[in-house]
């Protein structure tokens, strides 16, 4: 299926948007809680699932974007559900910093998409 | 207020370009994306693509590339969509709008401005 | 790209009657479906997002339910300025894609 002309932001760009955001930051989004995912079971996908029930808050809506950009690349992207913790909620800034660690984890051992 | 004022009715040739503008106020500019879209007369919304005036980041509509290009000047607000190699397929009323409460929901609207292509 | 199927195209019904639109989308989108009223001559405005979240002012008669590829929007009791056109969007993954329409008429 067709996806966005303009090439996906780089793991290295979401990196750096995530460190933005998070540090010296104790909350984010006023607190608000997101349910916990997987992110090895397809982390953009699984982390825009939860952080896309986050509104009303500018702080996270370039993260918001960039990891639709980069779900929308994946083969039937909107088709998987990721594994949701649904027993689990965790601050929203908890989320984005699991997400800043794995990816950095990706980022560093090379297998970037 | 938020708010988003754009430029006047364009009639165009076939194969010329369009450069449509949508000054913004109300709002700290680099804050948000403006989207564009489009709306043939009597028909449905499409969405051309959005651009981020905080770091000039854009993504397109597949359906628009190679045609469209958008651009963002910090110093007026003011973003800009230009479209080229004009056809009559092309008429329509463009809009440009920012999503402030949910990502990628445009909930303020400029008023459009309609391109008209005729030779 | 998504394809979002909204029907019916058209409905003509009487004042205080319950209007039903429905939008089904070509795969899962989640809750990431936002409705729009449209008048003619008008821009759209937004009414519902993330399925089923009003907007502020507007008013509590519009309501959306629905997730994965289903998803409903309802005006408990048609006023006669609810007579627009109405369109659902995606906004799961890019490119966002928008319903083709309904219009809603006073009998």
């Known amino acids: 299926s067709p996806s966005p002309v303009t090439p996906s932001p780089t793991l290295k760009e979401l990196i750096e948007e995530l460190v933005n955001i998070t540090q010296n930051q104790a909350s984010l989004c006023n607190g608000s809680m997101v349910w916990s995912v997987n992110l090895t079971a397809g982390m953009y996908c699984a982390a825009l699932e939860s952080l896309i029930n986050v509104s009303d808050c500018s702080a996270i809506q370039r993260t918001q974007r960039m990891l639709k950009a980069l779900c929308s690349q994946k083969p039937a992207a909107g088709q998987i559900s990721s594994e949701r913790s649904r027993d689990t909620k965790i601050e929203v800034i908890q989320l984005v910093k699991n997400l800043l660690t794995y990816v950095r984890g990706v980022y560093r051992h090379g297998n970037f998409r | 207020e938020v708010q988003l004022v754009q430029s006047g009715a364009e009639v165009v040739k076939p194969g010329a370009s369009v450069k449509v503008s949508c000054k913004t106020s109300?709002?700290?500019?680099?804050?948000?994306?403006i989207y564009w879209v489009r709306q043939a007369p009597g028909a449905g919304l499409e969405w051309i693509g959005y651009?981020?005036?905080?770091?000039?980041?854009?993504t397109y509509n597949q359906n628009f590339k190679d045609r469209v290009t958008l651009t963002a000047d910090k110093s007026t607000s003011t973003a800009y969509m230009e479209l080229s190699s004009l056809r009559a397929g092309d008429i329509a009323v463009y809009y440009c709008?920012?999503?402030?409460?949910?990502?990628?929901?445009?909930?303020?609207w400029g008023q459009g401005t309609l391109v008209t292509v005729s030779s | 790209e998504i394809v979002l199927t909204q029907s019916p195209a058209s409905l003509s019904l009487s004042q205080e009657e319950r209007v039903t639109i429905t939008c089904k989308a070509s795969?899962?989108?989640?809750?990431?479906v936002a409705w729009f009223q449209q008048k003619p001559g008008q821009a759209p405005k937004a009414l519902i997002y993330?399925?089923?979240n009003r907007y502020t002012g507007v008013p509590s008669r519009f309501s959306g339910s629905g997730s994965g590829t289903d998803f409903t929007l309802t005006i408990s009791s048609l006023e006669p300025e609810d007579v627009a056109d109405y369109f659902c969007?995606?906004?799961?993954?890019?490119?966002?894609?928008f319903g083709a329409g309904t219009k809603v008429e006073l009998k």
């Open positions: 709008a920012t999503a402030v409460v949910a990502t990628d929901v445009m909930e303020n």
């Open positions: 109300g709002y700290s500019f680099t804050d948000y994306p």
């Open positions: 651009i981020d005036p905080y770091n000039g980041g854009t």
């Open positions: 993330l399925a089923s």
């Open positions: 969007l995606q906004h799961w993954n890019y490119p966002l894609t």
């Open positions: 795969q899962n989108v989640r809750n990431a």
